[in-house]
């Protein structure tokens, strides 16, 4: 039969993953680490280190594993049920509005400001005005003091787009 697309099809169909593995679909869905076969009768395993699926699904294909970019470190490898977890290297961070690349953290705050937050893998150092305590906008300062920052350690997952 040919498949017609409806609006409700556009929302991913997912549910929480129990621990057992199955070789045939349950209620038309395959478990994490698998995708559904073309005829819908079988669940086919994803290829370890190459692709993955995280939820019960009726996907025709597993999702390609993210490969960490240069400037990133791999915190955990891709498995059949979980994507690679990448993190910006020490001294760099990834902003929410530009998640595709790691940017260098500033080494210090502009004159008249004091550092209140360290460089982490997901944020630049945070500077506030000494007097008012208001945050600095994040623009690159013309003059920097020699206040160095220490990078943070928590992990942030890579974006799914790879």
């Amino acid at each position: 039969e040919s498949a017609l697309i409806t609006q409700q099809d556009l929302a991913p169909q997912q549910r929480a993953a129990p621990q057992q593995k199955r070789s045939s679909p349950s209620e038309g869905l395959c478990p994490p680490g698998h995708h559904i076969s073309e005829d819908g009768r079988d669940c086919i395993s994803c290829k370890y280190g190459q692709d993955y699926s995280t939820h019960w699904n009726d996907l025709l294909f597993c999702l390609r594993c993210t490969r960490c970019d240069s400037g990133e470190v791999e915190l955990s490898p891709c498995t059949t049920t979980r994507n690679t977890v990448c993190q910006c290297e020490e001294g760099t961070f990834r902003e929410e509005d530009s998640p595709e690349m790691c940017r260098k953290c500033r080494t210090g705050c502009p004159r008249g400001m004091v550092k209140v937050g360290d460089c982490t893998p997901w944020s630049d150092i945070e500077c506030v005005h000494k007097e008012s305590g208001t945050k600095h906008s994040g623009e690159v300062p013309a003059v920097e003091e020699t206040v160095t920052s220490s990078p943070g350690t928590p992990a942030s997952p890579c974006s799914l787009s790879g």
Epitope: A3, I5, L10, G28, L59, F61, C62, R64, L160
Partner: nanobody, 125 residues
Framework: EVQLLESGGGLVQPGGSLRLSCAAS????????MSWFRQAPGKGLEFVSA????????YYADSVKGRFTISRDNSKNTLYLQMNSLRAEDTAVYYC??????????????????WGQGTLVTVSS
């Protein structure tokens, strides 16, 4: 972010062949599954064929199985659909799409997916 441009459509006689291309620009689509849909005049959107990111797992609708072949060249960022033994009922606008994956019913899956503008295939004598 990603632009998909189909080409290769045209008028062909029943039994004839056409090869459609879908060129991606803006960023590489080698991480994405890709597919072909079609819409016949006055009909809904039909899922025709799909191919995974690596090009080694395919899907075909029953209506085109054995006649159409989907393939991709990741080095050229291009998807193809070789259509043989064309029939009048294959007349439609053909669209390509890219997504992280596609559900069995054809719905694109993932945070981002992209569609082309379509190319018209007319099968008529």
């Amino acid at each position: 972010e990603v632009q998909l441009l189909e080409s290769g459509g045209g008028l062909v006689q029943p039994g004839g062949s056409l090869r459609l291309s879908c060129a991606a620009s803006g960023r590489t689509v080698s991480n994405y599954a890709m597919s072909w849909f079609r819409q016949a005049p006055g009909k809904g959107l039909e899922f025709v064929s799909a191919l995974n990111w690596g090009g080694d797992t395919t899907y075909y609708a029953d209506s085109v199985k054995g006649r159409f072949t989907i393939s991709r060249d990741n080095s050229k960022n291009t998807l193809y659909l070789q259509m043989n033994s064309l029939r009048a009922e294959d007349t439609a606008v053909y669209y390509c799409a890219a997504a992280q994956s596609f559900r069995r019913g054809g719905a694109p899956y993932g945070d981002n997916y992209w569609w082309g503008q379509g190319t018209l295939v007319t099968v008529s004598s």
